[in-house]
């Protein structure tokens, strides 16, 4: 279920844009980072893919949004929501949030000024 979003700008417009992009590379990139860099990711579908490759694919996808800058927070919130139930300890959730907030900078976008990554219902 999709939560209400849109601290900045037209939330319905951002929601449509976030829906249209493929956030899987971003999710995979962040999961790889919090699990620690290794020579090979045996449990990943593209075995030779390194975190940096996923990062580039992630940045490319985020760039597909018409208003990347304005809708960045909504995209980050959706990634958080998608992965929330996978994270079963408090430190890992904090680590995931930190990596998520670093994402715009890694992609050479401006970080959203205010972006609440706490998923509704207190799940993350």
């Amino acid at each position: 279920m999709r939560r209400e979003r849109g601290r900045q700008g037209d939330s319905s417009s951002c929601e449509r844009q976030v829906d249209r992009v493929n956030l899987k590379p971003c999710e995979q990139h962040i999961m790889q980072r919090i699990m620690g860099e290794q020579e090979q990711y045996d449990s990943y579908d593209i075995r030779s893919t390194r975190s940096s490759d996923q990062q580039q694919r992630c940045c490319d996808e985020l760039n597909e949004m018409e208003n990347t800058q304005r809708c960045m927070c909504e995209a980050l919130q959706q990634i958080m929501e998608n992965q929330c139930d996978r994270l079963q300890d408090r430190q890992m959730v904090q680590q995931f949030k930190r990596e998520l907030m670093n994402l715009p900078q890694q992609c050479n976008f401006r970080a959203p000024q205010r972006c609440d990554l706490d998923v509704s219902g207190g799940r993350c």
Epitope: K24, D45, R86, L87, Q91, G122, R123
Partner: antibody, heavy 118, light 111 residues
């Protein structure tokens, strides 16, 4: 090292209630999701319930939903399972289990035996 | 519900020889985040289960490197490169993609 010690297992009649406890040590208890898993010769290993580190979210197997309640007291490093309307097929060893952080079970207690019989 | 099956259900082994256990799920265990949610546990006689392999292929802390996990989608394998006497017990696979479901177990004993 991580230690999980279960208690409270007894012989109880069908329809009865029981409360299991698990005392945890050797790790920061209030950082981790905790689970109950049971094991019987009939059903093998069966996940029962989980509770997030702060108690904000609980989940149950369909077979125990509405009858069992998981809870925790982080100030006491303790996990609980309140079992009501017990049935014969609830008879099993009940293990207290720590989540490793990504939905795998990295530490198990020694188990406590629950027998539901008239 | 995701149903887990294992084969063989019983595996007599010779110390020093390799051994392999197969686990199959009724649906793919690959999440959108790229991780396969499949773990392996060993329950030695009279003991609680212990984690061997998590997320498809990652060896748990303290687990000897003779144990390895592989596979993708619905088919997974646990390999022991050289079986030792202490490896006897029941091996279980478990999926954690949707809630948690264990396989029926594979009993490994010495021939």
């Amino acid at each position: 090292q991580v230690q999980l010690v279960e208690s409270g297992g007894l012989v109880v009649q069908p329809g009865g209630s029981l409360r299991l406890s698990c005392e945890a040590s050797g790790f920061t208890f209030d950082d981790y999701t905790m689970h109950w898993v049971r094991q019987s010769p009939q059903k093998g290993l069966e996940w029962v319930s989980l509770i997030r580190w702060d108690g904000s979210r609980t989940e149950y197997a369909d077979s125990v939903k509405g009858r069992f309640t998981i809870s925790r007291d982080n100030s006491k490093n303790s996990l609980y399972l309140q079992m009501n309307t017990l049935r014969a097929d609830d008879s099993a060893f009940y293990f207290c289990v720590k989540d490793g952080g990504l939905r795998y079970f990295d530490s198990w207690g020694q188990g406590t035996l629950v027998t539901v019989s008239s | 519900d995701v149903v887990m099956t294992q084969s063989p259900l019983s595996l007599p082994v010779t110390p020093g020889e390799p051994a392999s256990i197969s686990c199959r799920s009724s649906q793919s265990l690959l999440h959108s985040n790229g991780i396969h949610y499949l773990d392996w546990y060993l329950q030695k006689p009279g003991q609680s289960p212990q984690l061997l392999i998590y997320l498809g292929s990652k060896r748990a802390s303290g687990v000897p490197d003779r144990f390895s996990g592989s596979g993708s989608g619905t088919d997974f394998t646990l390999k022991i490169s050289r079986v030792e006497a202490e490896d006897v017990g029941v091996y279980y696979c478990m999926q954690s993609l949707q809630t948690f479901t264990f396989g029926p177990g594979t009993k490994v004993d010495i021939k």
